[in-house]
């Protein structure tokens, strides 16, 4: 005997109480595939979530995080508090980046400044809590006789004060 449920399209469920008739999903529920025997409850985007896409009879609601938070995980399963640039989120809240590290976003961790000398370059612009250092030409390129119309200011490693 053919299973009549396989004929039920998305947005409906196969109602065993009514001789396998295809019934529309009740309000606040959906079925995204055909042949379903039940409809799934729609996700509620409340509290720390806000609605990005409303639930329909064939697809679940999609949530975003409210202002001051950002999504984590598949389908925005969690919301994590934003921090300011120059900070990272710890177990005790937002903390400033330690010296020698930076974060240019509202999320994520503080990362070490680029070590320009590893690439044979010098520091053109010092790093800050919010910005990485900018590496410039190698020290050899700045020696007397090097062809440069306007030689850049003396380079310094990050955090070193001028002599």
């Amino acid at each position: 005997l053919q299973d009549l449920c396989s004929n039920c399209p998305a947005g409906t469920f196969c109602d065993n109480n009514r001789s396998q008739i295809c019934s529309p999903c009740p309000p606040n529920s959906f079925s995204s595939a055909g042949g379903q025997r039940t409809c799934d409850i729609c996700r509620q985007c409340k509290g720390v979530f806000k609605t990005r896409k409303e639930c329909s009879s064939t697809s679940n609601a999609e949530c975003d995080c409210i202002s001051g938070y950002h999504c984590l995980g598949a389908e925005c399963s969690m919301c994590e508090q934003d921090c300011k640039q120059g900070q990272e989120l710890t177990k005790k809240g937002c903390k400033d980046c330690c010296f020698g590290t930076f974060n240019d976003q509202k999320r994520g961790i503080c990362r070490p400044w680029t070590n320009c000398s590893l690439d044979g370059k010098s520091v053109l612009v010092n790093g800050t809590k919010e910005r990485d250092v900018v590496c410039g030409p190698s020290p050899a390129d700045l020696s007397p006789g090097a062809s440069s119309a306007t030689p850049p200011a003396p380079a310094r490693e990050p955090g070193h004060s001028p002599q």
């Epitope: 409340k46 509290g47 720390v48 979530f49 984590l72 399963s77 969690m78 919301c79 994590e80 508090q81 989120l89 177990k91 809240g93």
Partner: nanobody, 117 residues
Framework: QVQLQESGGGLVQPGGSLRLSCAAS????????MTWVRQAPGKGLEWVSS????????IYADSVKGRFTISRDNAKNTLYLQMNNLRPEDTAVYFC??????????SGPGTQVTVSS
């Protein structure tokens, strides 16, 4: 699917008490820190209190310290918030959340608490 269902809200006079409950399902409740947050009319989300997975570590917002008590029953997969000496400024929709004050997920409709004479 993670489900959190809040209940226990209502209308209460200043100085009164309410006990909120949050029934959890769809995840291993005893593995997670749980949190209460609230949203007053026209305001942003405010963290209220958090409790560690085993219940040994508890923290409160200054605004509710000494008046509210968070607790949990891992055998019943339920989170509680006992609210005493309620004030008009406690009027809000209260949500329970899986996670900490900094990283959380809410899925219930919330429960309305109104403090008014």
């Amino acid at each position: 699917q993670v489900q959190l269902q809040e209940s226990g809200g209502g209308l209460v006079q200043p100085g009164g008490s309410l006990r909120l409950s949050c029934a959890a399902s769809g995840f291993t409740f005893s593995d997670h820190t749980m949190t209460w947050v609230r949203q007053a009319p026209g305001k942003g989300l405010e963290w209220v209190s958090s409790i560690s997975s085993g219940g040994s570590r508890i923290i409160y917002a200054d605004s509710v310290k000494g008046r509210f008590t968070i607790s949990r029953d891992n055998a019943k997969n339920t989170l509680y918030l006992q609210m005493n000496n309620l004030r008009p400024e406690d009027t809000a929709v209260y949500f329970c959340a899986r996670g900490t004050r900094y990283k959380m997920s809410t899925s219930g409709p919330g429960t309305q608490v109104t403090v008014s004479s």
